[in-house]
C-alpha cells in the first residue's frame, strides 16, 4: 500500500501545535511525535524498527522542516523506550518514549501537550486533529510545512467489521474516519488531539490510506497511562 501521509489535509497554522515533534533518522523526517513532558517525546514503536544503525534525533519548534525558524531546535536522544509488548508484526502497544538529551527549551512554539489519563472511549463523531509531515500524495510528495486534518472518531464496532479491520481493534486502540481525509504510516507517532487533549497516537502499521473501509488506527494513550507514568518517573 502507499506509504503513510496526511491525505486531504491542509497546511497547519505555523507553530500553533507547539507539542508537535519530528522524529528524524540521519537528518530526514521519519515519524511524528508529541512532546508530553519537558524531556520526553511520545511516538510509535515501529518507527525505530529499521533505525538500528542510524542517528535518531527529535526536532521541536518546527513548522518548516527546511527553512530557518528561531524556535527550531534538534535534540539528540538519550534513551529510546519502546513499549515492552510492542512487536514488529502487530499494531498493538505501538508506543515509544524518547528521552531527549536535555530538557527542551519551552516557549510559545515548544510546549508539552496534556494527555488523556481517563480510560474512556472518545465519543464517536468527535472531531479530532491529526498533524504531521507525512507524504501527501501517492507519488511521495513530502511537505516541507506541517500539515493537519480534522477527522471524526469512528465507533469500534464499525471499525471492527469484517470489511474494515476485522476484529483487530482492541479496547486499547481507536479509529477515525478515512474517507479521502486520512493519516497514515508516514505520520506514524504523531498526535490525535481531541478537545485540546492528546487522545491517540498514529499507529505505524501498513494499510491502504484514504479508503473509508480502512479507517485510521490510533493507540489510545489513556490505556497506557501507567506505563507512560512509570517511564517518565
Amino acid at each position: 500500500p502507499p506509504r503513510g501521509r496526511i491525505l486531504g489535509g491542509r497546511e497547519a497554522e505555523a507553530h500553533a501545535r507547539p507539542y508537535m515533534a519530528s522524529v528524524q533518522l540521519n537528518g530526514a523526517h521519519l515519524c511524528g511525535g508529541v512532546l508530553v513532558a519537558e524531556q520526553w517525546v511520545l511516538s510509535a514503536a515501529h518507527c525505530l524498527e529499521d533505525a538500528a544503525d542510524g542517528k535518531v534525533q527529535v526536532l521541536l519548534g518546527a513548522h518548516s522542516l527546511s527553512q530557518p525558524e528561531p524556535s527550531k531546535r534538534l535534540y539528540d536522544v538519550l534513551r529510546a523506550v519502546p513499549h515492552p509488548d510492542s512487536q514488529p508484526d502487530t499494531i498493538d502497544h505501538d508506543l515509544l518514549l524518547l528521552q531527549l538529551s536535555e530538557k527542551a527549551t519551552l516557549g510559545p512554539a515548544v510546549r508539552p501537550l496534556p494527555w488523556q489519563r481517563v480510560d474512556r472511549d472518545v465519543a464517536p463523531g468527535t472531531l479530532c486533529d491529526v498533524a504531521g509531515w507525512g507524504i501527501v500524495n501517492h507519488a511521495g510528495r513530502r511537505p516541507d510545512s506541517l500539515q493537519h486534518v480534522l477527522l471524526p472518531v469512528l465507533d469500534r464496532a464499525t471499525c471492527n467489521r469484517r470489511t474494515h479491520h476485522d476484529g483487530a481493534i482492541t479496547e486499547r486502540l481507536m479509529c477515525a474516519e478515512s474517507n479521502r481525509r486520512d493519516s497514515c504510516k508516514g505520520d506514524s507517532g504523531g498526535p490525535l488531539v481531541c478537545g485540546g487533549v492528546l487522545e491517540g497516537v498514529v499507529t505505524s502499521g501498513s494499510r491502504v490510506c484514504g479508503n473509508r473501509k480502512k479507517p485510521g488506527i490510533y493507540t489510545r494513550v489513556a490505556s497506557y497511562a501507567a506505563w507512560i507514568d512509570s517511564v517518565l518517573a
Epitope: R3, A28, D50, L65, N137, R141, R142
Partner: antibody
C-alpha cells in the same frame, strides 16, 4: 554529499529491454523516494514514475505503465528502471532524481543516454 | 494532465543583467511549482521550490514568485555560469509535468 551515479550510455536493439541503474550515496537510501524522468533529444522533461525504496511501492505515470518497471536493491543503495519492448521512441536520456520537498526533485543523476538502433 | 507553458523558449541577456522567466499552469497548482537549471552537458539542478524557497547551495541571486497559475523565476546580476536552460515543474497533481524550457543565452 548526495550523489546519484548513472552509467553514461546504453546502445540497445529494437524489441529488447534495458535495465538502467542509479547508485545513491551520501544519504540514507530508504528515507527518500526516487523519481525517474525522460528527456528526448532537444525536448523537454517527462516524469515516468517514482519508487519508495523502503518498501518498493511504485507509482507510474499512466503513459509509462507497461513500458517502465522500477525496482530497488537496498543492499547496494541502487535504484533500477527496466524499459521493455524498445523502439526508437525510447531513445532518450533517462534521469533518476531524489524526492525533495513539495513535489520537487532535489538531486539528479547525470543521466543515461539510451540509443535504440539496429 | 496539467500543461506547463514557458512561452519564451529562448532569451538573450548580458552579464550583470536581471532576467525573469515565466511559467504558466493550465490550472491552479497551489504553489507547488519548482524550478530547475539544465547545463549543456545535461546536468540538472534544483534551484527553487514551492515556489520561492531556495534549495540549499543555490546563490541568492535566484528568486521565485507566483501563485495560482502564474509563476516566475528571476535571476539578478547574471553570471557566466547562469547561461543554461531553465525548466519549471508542477508538483501539485499527478502525473507531475514540466514546462518546455527557456534557454538563456549570452547576448
Amino acid at each position: 554529499q548526495v550523489q546519484l551515479q548513472q552509467p553514461g550510455a546504453e546502445l540497445v536493439r529494437p524489441g529488447t529491454s534495458v535495465k538502467l541503474s542509479c547508485k545513491a550515496s551520501g544519504y540514507t537510501f530508504t528515507s527518500y523516494w526516487m523519481h525517474w524522468v525522460k528527456q528526448r533529444p532537444g525536448q523537454g522533461l517527462e516524469w515516468i514514475g517514482v519508487i519508495d525504496p523502503s518498501d518498493s511501492y511504485t507509482y507510474y505515470n499512466q503513459k509509462f505503465k507497461g513500458k517502465a518497471t522500477l525496482t530497488v536493491d537496498t543492499s547496494s543503495s541502487t535504484a533500477y528502471m527496466q524499459l521493455s519492448s524498445l523502439t526508437s521512441e525510447d531513445s532518450a536520456v533517462y534521469y533518476c532524481a531524489r524526492n525533495g520537498y513539495d513535489g520537487a526533485m532535489d538531486y539528479w543523476g547525470q543521466g543515461t543516454s539510451v540509443t535504440v538502433s539496429s | 494532465e496539467i500543461q506547463m507553458t514557458q512561452t519564451t523558449s529562448s532569451l538573450s541577456a548580458s552579464l550583470g543583467d536581471r532576467v525573469t522567466i515565466s511559467c504558466r499552469a493550465s490550472q491552479d497548482i497551489s504553489n507547488y511549482l519548482n524550478w530547475y537549471q539544465q547545463k549543456p552537458d545535461g546536468t540538472v539542478k534544483l534551484l527553487i521550490y514551492y515556489p520561492s524557497r531556495l534549495h540549499s547551495g543555490v546563490p541568492s541571486r535566484f528568486s521565485g514568485s507566483g501563485s495560482g497559475t502564474d509563476y516566475s523565476l528571476t535571476i539578478s546580476n547574471l553570471e557566466q555560469e547562469d547561461f543554461a536552460t531553465y525548466f519549471c515543474q508542477q508538483g501539485n497533481t499527478l502525473p507531475y509535468t514540466f514546462g518546455g524550457g527557456t534557454k538563456l543565452e549570452i547576448k
